[in-house]
């Protein structure tokens, strides 16, 4: 497959909406903001990635947090759950 | 167990047209959701058209105006007419069903095998 980093000219996600759905997998790792994604989980449920595309989505949560997802995250992770190893979950400090 | 099967794709010219059909058992389109993704040669796969009573119906921008996707809940498939074919829609085209869970959110997914569809003189 053809590698490709940077995001297209008017791609970037200003959030995260169903639109998304439409963007190969380059295209979320390139043009969609760990930061927003974080802060913007509750809305991921609602849309229907593939599983593939929720691979991307969880690698670029695992850059964001490398020691683990905080609270805020893991309240909102819906169906990405079921993308989570046991390792990812041992590294969760939930209360 | 679930399945879901393509069939109509070929080789067709420029300019022309062609319908892929997806035919699911084991499973409703109704009330969940069916999409059409390609992949061609070298590329990730892309979704082209979808369709959910959640979402309603949506298309790719490169596709808008040219393919049309449709569901005949009788027969439980998901169609996608698609006219006006260039070489840039050479690809393998999959269909792709997802259940809509209750509670919201989705479940599993399903895919074709893939029907080749080639433009060219």
């Known amino acids: 497959e053809v590698e490709k980093t940077a995001c297209p000219s008017g791609k970037k996600a200003p959030e995260i909406d169903e639109s998304l759905i439409f963007y190969k997998k380059w295209e979320l790792e390139a043009c969609v903001d760990a930061a927003l994604l974080a802060t913007q989980m509750d809305r991921v449920n609602a849309i229907p990635f593939t599983y593939e595309q929720l691979d991307v989505l969880k690698h670029k949560l695992d850059e964001l947090y490398p020691q683990g997802y905080p609270e805020s995250v893991i309240q909102h992770l819906g169906y990405l759950f079921l993308k989570m190893s046991p390792e990812d979950i041992r590294k969760w400090n939930v209360t | 167990e679930v399945q879901v099967v393509e069939s109509g794709g070929g080789l067709v010219q420029p300019g022309g047209s062609l319908r892929l059909s997806c035919a699911a058992s084991g499973i409703t389109f109704s009330g969940n959701y069916g999409g059409w993704f390609r992949q061609a040669p070298g590329e990730q796969r892309e979704l082209v058209a979808s369709?959910?009573?959640?979402?309603?119906?949506k298309y790719a921008d490169p596709v808008k105006g040219r393919f049309t996707i449709s569901t005949d809940t009788a027969k439980n498939t998901v169609d996608l007419q698609m006219n006006s074919l260039g070489p840039e829609d050479t690809a393998v085209y999959y269909c792709?069903?997802?259940?809509?869970?209750?509670?919201?959110?989705?479940?599993?997914?399903?895919w074709g095998q893939g029907t080749q569809v080639t433009v060219s003189s």
């Open positions: 369709m959910s009573s959640a979402l309603g119906t």
């Open positions: 792709y069903a997802r259940v809509r869970l209750s509670r919201g959110g989705w479940g599993s997914e399903y």
